[in-house]
Interface confidence: low
């Protein structure tokens, strides 16, 4: 297992609709054809997997149908979007990239993106 540098923004503010997007960029030491991207959430020293996708270079990322993540890839960059976020989901979102094929296997883990989510104020009742 060899180390690989992964860069991601330090802070991202989710939209009022609970959507946050950020770029995860990795320094590929070789010509990987199969890449796995995993988003981990760290909160209170607990790390949980948010979503993961394996893709062939040049193809779209495919997350599970019920995943809250979507994404696109371009070269060594992955554009990740997480949807359905609420204030309680505020935390550090870590991008992990694995170059699965061909060997040797490379693993890179970013420093994390702090995603802040603010629940929108409920609209006041209207008379009309």
């Amino acid at each position: 297992c060899k180390a690989m540098h992964v860069a991601q923004p330090a802070v991202v503010l989710a939209s009022s609709r609970g959507i946050a997007s950020f770029v995860c960029e990795y320094a590929s030491p070789g010509k990987a054809t199969e890449v796995r991207v995993t988003v981990l959430r760290q909160a209170d020293s607990q790390v949980t997997e948010v979503c993961a996708a394996t893709y062939m270079m040049g193809n779209e990322l495919t997350f599970l149908d019920d995943s809250i993540c979507t994404g696109t890839s371009s070269g060594n960059q992955v554009n990740l979007t997480i949807q359905g976020l609420r204030a309680m989901d505020t935390g550090l979102y870590i991008c992990k990239v694995e170059l699965m094929y061909p060997p040797p296997y490379y693993l890179g883990i970013g420093n994390g993106t702090q995603i802040y989510v603010i629940d929108p104020e409920p609209c006041p009742d209207s008379d009309f």
């Epitope: 199969e34 796995r36 993961a52 996708a53 394996t54 699965m100 094929y101 060997p103 040797p104 693993l107």
Partner: antibody, heavy 124, light 107 residues
Framework: QLQLQESGPGLVKPSETLSLTCTVS??????????WGWIRQPPGKGLEWIGS???????YYNPSLKSRVTISVDTSKNQFSLELSSVAAADTAVYYC????????????????WGQGTLVTVSS | DIQMTQSPSSLSASVGDRVTITCRAS??????LGWYQQKPGKAPKRLIY???SLQSGVPSRFSGSGSGTEFTLTISSLQPEDFATYYC?????????FGQGTKVEIK
């Protein structure tokens, strides 16, 4: 509970091709978290890793066997298979299939589930 | 290829004994090492992964340690069901290789 079951002929003639299938039950072979592998053990000897496959079809082979080995996967049947061509008496062994897991804590792989093994004898 | 050398090849011990098996790698493998137990006619059983992490369901008398090139498997108090052959395996680089095995016999 995940289970792996090897199947195939127990006797193969020299110079022919050994073909084995591993059927996975209790879990999906298409999970992106795992590899699937073959290991063999000649009678009274140690273990030898033959090769591994990812559900996408990407393969990793032991160079000592690479010219004779083909590992394939059939996600629709939840199976993966081993073919070893031009067999000789030295290929007589118990053949195991296994799941390869990935430990996120350290980035290590490990074999966590094994089939019970099937003895393949190469003899005329 | 990375060569894995286990020592001793075999040992005799009594129930209750503390047993230590060593595995050496021909080059550094970080902590990418697993330990397996095998009984006659059975498939290997997972014991330790990542050099020192105990597989769930494995008794706590088993422990693993080491990093780099030297690793040990320790059985703190040998039980009757522990008499078996133990293998180490490196999963750091291809081809993944096993040690030759250590047979633990009853004294």
């Amino acid at each position: 509970q995940l289970q792996l079951q090897e199947s195939g002929p127990g006797l193969v003639k020299p110079s022919e091709t050994l073909s084995l299938t591993c059927t996975v039950s209790g879990g999906s072979i298409s999970s992106s978290s795992y590899y699937w592998g073959w290991i063999r053990q000649p009678p009274g000897k140690g273990l030898e890793w033959i090769g591994s496959i990812y559900y996408s079809g990407s393969t990793y082979y032991n160079p000592s066997l690479k010219s004779r080995v083909t590992i394939s996967v059939d996600t629709s049947k939840n199976q993966f298979s081993l073919e070893l061509s031009s067999v000789a008496a030295a290929d007589t062994a118990v053949y195991y299939c296994a799941r390869v897991s990935y430990y996120y804590g350290s980035g290590s792989y490990y074999f966590d589930y094994w089939g019970q093994g099937t003895l393949v004898t190469v003899s005329s | 290829d990375i060569q894995m050398t286990q020592s001793p090849s075999s040992l005799s011990a009594s129930v209750g004994d503390r047993v230590t098996i060593t595995c050496r790698a021909s080059q550094g493998i970080r902590n990418d090492l697993g330990w397996y137990q095998q009984k006659p006619g059975k498939a290997p059983k997972r014991l330790i992964y990542a050099a020192s992490s105990l597989q769930s369901g494995v008794p706590s008398r088993f422990s693993g340690s080491g990093s780099g090139t030297e690793f040990t498997l320790t059985i703190s108090s040998l039980q009757p069901e522990d008499f078996a052959t133990y293998y180490c395996q490196q999963l750091n680089s291809y081809p993944w290789t096993f040690g030759q095995g250590t047979k633990v016999e009853i004294k």
